[in-house]
């Protein structure tokens, strides 16, 4: 069935700022995808086209992009009667009208709305369930539920404390199943909001962007402390473990790294790469640090090879590898990391995420399939996992509705898959593991 | 000050009953985990159960599941310990122990209220 | 559930002596580690937390390390108010176990 219509709107993201929505039509009806957005973008991603008309929505409206989609994009798609079943199809048709190497021509916002809602669209036609949708064109047979990763201590450049890396997320491994993953994160979630009350007061129980909290930590240790003591209240410390997300590159200086960056700058406390490495592994000793996120800057790949080699942990390549299928084969052949973040929007389009999923695993890697901090209602994250077998997403706390609406679609994919579901748990490295 | 006083313990006959309390004070009752750990004539600690105040959450070691109940009173500052089906192996000095601000240590001891199951 | 094993039993020393005491977890604890003093007919009183940190009025002579299966809580310089018997406990996961105790007398 081909595509009748697409019409693309300006709506608004968790964060307040312009994204895009996309309404595709075909005779089966009417089929939505709203794209995210990042905080921090890294370098060597496809470009997130932006207004930058300063008087209005402080430059970041995206009507450039919904025009894009409106009069260049939505005539040929329809004109070219292209069915939507043939994802690869239409993201190339996308991908060479734009013809620049980092979608900065349409906006991969553009590209990966559109991109999206073909994909809906396809599921509908082939009937069968989205996550089914998505992996039969990744070529999986099966599909797993995902071990949830939450994140619920936020620090970094984005928080207003002290605390230099940027997520602290717990992991319920030794849930039987996805509901009781949940209920495990939720408990700890609310343990954890009143060990903060108690400690750091009631304002420190405000949210952050993700849903999760940033009480004014000084020592990265403390943050490890509040979540092993959240977790032992919860009574499920043998269920939970930890991973981080430190976003190094934002307090990498010169060759160095700066714990305490939000001070006043002080070249001489900024500590070595392989420091900074001693001090991961005297968080890995300590408490049950399974998954460390960008321990160090994006170009500093020594430091990355070193790590990884000597962790015995996940390493998963964030800002180094941006989902872009040029940054992953180095990293695999560099042996860099051994896990890929899946930010659909970082790479543009759904062909291409699942193209950056099947490197990364033909390649033995893990990969954790990511939400943005500018999130929507929109679900096919949840989905994607699903369908990917990657056996692990991050999409924020139990808290706030776009964070929930990931995690309740999950929930809804559970009780459809019934007694064929499959979660992930202890095998989330690796789910498909026999 | 923290303190914390146990009462209830003595002489009790195999298969009886008794009812420990712990009356706590100095600090935020609702605020902490609280534990139970008995100590049997010369020998060693042995951690019975706890209970946290944020969602009435409750632990035993197995040992001691079904026959002691752990609960708590916070209009009266006051932990229990529910022990039945008694045994002259339950014979011991108990202790309530209040878990500190980070989880698993317990920094505030009662002076410990002795049992003695005997026929 | 995770056994906690202590060594010595017992142990004799001298005021000023340097002395240390190892407890072993049947499994990997990371630093969930908590060590006790008690004295006879006296409740335990907290010594040593996350297998390293004093918490707040225990002299600094007291010092703990290790992590992962294998810790040792060390006393720099014997006091005559040290002798007494010491318990080390996991807290990874219930049930919290503690180690048989060392008891620590007067050569």
């Known amino acids: 069935m081909s595509i009748l219509k697409i019409h693309a709107r300006e709506i608004f993201d968790s964060r307040g700022n312009p994204t895009v929505e996309v309404d595709l039509f075909t005779s089966k009806g009417l089929f939505r995808a709203a794209v995210p957005s990042g905080a921090s973008t890294g370098i060597y991603e496809a470009l997130e086209l932006r207004d930058n008309d300063k008087t209005r929505y402080m430059g970041k409206g995206v009507s450039k992009a919904v025009e894009h989609i409106n009069k260049t994009i939505a005539p040929a798609l329809v004109s070219k009667k292209l069915n939507v079943t043939e994802q690869e199809k239409i993201d190339k048709l996308m991908i060479e009208m734009d013809g620049t190497e980092n979608k900065s021509k349409f906006g991969a916002n553009a590209i990966l709305g559109v991109s999206l809602a073909v994909c809906k669209a396809g599921a509908v036609e082939k009937g069968v369930p989205l996550y089914r949708h998505i992996a039969d064109l990744a070529g999986n047979s099966e599909v797993i539920l995902p071990v949830p990763a939450f994140n619920v201590i936020n620090g970094g450049s984005h928080a207003g404390n002290k605390l230099a890396m940027q997520e602290f997320m717990i992991l319920p491994v030794g849930a039987a199943n996805f509901r009781e993953a949940m209920r495990i994160g939720a408990e700890v979630y609310h343990n954890l909001k009143n060990v903060i009350k108690e400690k750091y007061g009631k304002d420190a129980t405000n949210v952050g962007d993700e849903g999760g909290f940033a009480p004014n930590i000084l020592e990265n240790k403390e943050g490890l402390e509040l979540l092993k003591t959240a977790i032992g209240k919860a009574g499920y410390t043998d269920k939970v473990v930890i991973g981080m997300d430190v976003a190094a590159s934002e307090f990498f200086r010169s060759g160095k790294y700066d714990l305490d960056f939000k001070s006043p700058d002080d070249p001489s406390r900024y500590i070595s790469p392989d420091q900074l490495a001693d001090l991961y592994k005297s968080f890995i000793k300590d408490y049950p640090v399974v998954s460390i996120e960008d321990p160090f800057d994006q170009d500093d790949w020594g430091a990355w090879q070193k790590f990884t080699a000597s962790a015995g942990i996940q390493v998963v390549g964030d800002d180094l590898t941006v989902t872009n299928p040029k940054r992953i084969a180095k990293a695999v052949n560099e042996k860099s990391c051994n896990c890929l973040l899946l930010k659909v929007n970082q790479i543009g389009s759904v062909t291409e995420s699942l193209q950056a999923c099947k490197l990364a695993q033909a390649n033995g890697w893990g990969v954790m399939v990511s939400h943005r901090s500018g999130e929507t209602e929109d679900t096919f994250i949840a989905d994607l996992v699903v369908g990917l077998c990657t056996g692990q997403i991050k999409t924020g706390a139990p808290c706030r509705s776009e964070r929930l609406a990931k995690y309740n679609q999950l929930l809804r994919i559970e009780e459809e898959l019934g007694s064929k579901a499959k979660f992930a748990g202890r095998n989330f490295r690796n789910p498909l593991a026999k | 000050e923290v303190q914390l006083v146990e009462s209830g313990g003595g002489l009790v006959q195999p298969g009886g009953s008794l009812r420990l309390s712990c009356a706590a004070s100095?600090?935020?009752?609702?605020?902490?985990?609280m534990n139970w750990v008995r100590q049997a004539p010369g020998k060693g600690l042995e951690w019975v159960a706890y209970?946290?105040?944020?969602?009435?959450?409750?632990k035993y070691n197995e040992k001691f599941k079904g026959r002691f109940t752990i609960s708590r009173d916070d209009s009266k500052n006051t932990l229990y310990l529910q022990m039945n089906s008694l045994r002259a192996e339950d014979t011991a000095v108990y202790y309530c122990?209040?878990?500190?601000?980070?989880?698993?240590?317990?920094?505030?001891w009662g002076q410990g209220t002795l049992v003695t199951v005997s026929s | 559930d995770i056994q906690m094993t202590q060594s010595p039993s017992s142990l004799s020393a001298s005021v000023g002596d340097r002395v240390t005491i190892t407890c072993r977890a049947s499994?990997?604890?990371?630093?969930?580690l908590t060590w006790y003093q008690q004295k006879p007919g006296k409740a335990p009183k907290l010594l040593i937390y996350?297998?390293?940190t004093l918490p707040e009025g225990v002299p600094s002579r007291f010092s703990g390390s290790g992590s992962g299966t294998d810790f040792t809580l060390t006393i720099s310089s014997l006091q005559p108010e040290d002798f007494a018997t010491y318990y080390c406990q996991h807290h990874y996961g219930t049930p919290y176990t503690f180690g048989q105790g060392t008891k620590l007398e007067i050569k």
């Open positions: 996350n297998a390293k």
């Open positions: 122990a209040r878990e500190g601000f980070y989880y698993g240590n317990f920094d505030n």
């Open positions: 499994e990997n604890i990371y630093s969930y």
């Open positions: 209970i946290n105040p944020y969602n009435d959450g409750t």
């Open positions: 100095g600090y935020t009752f609702t605020s902490c985990v």
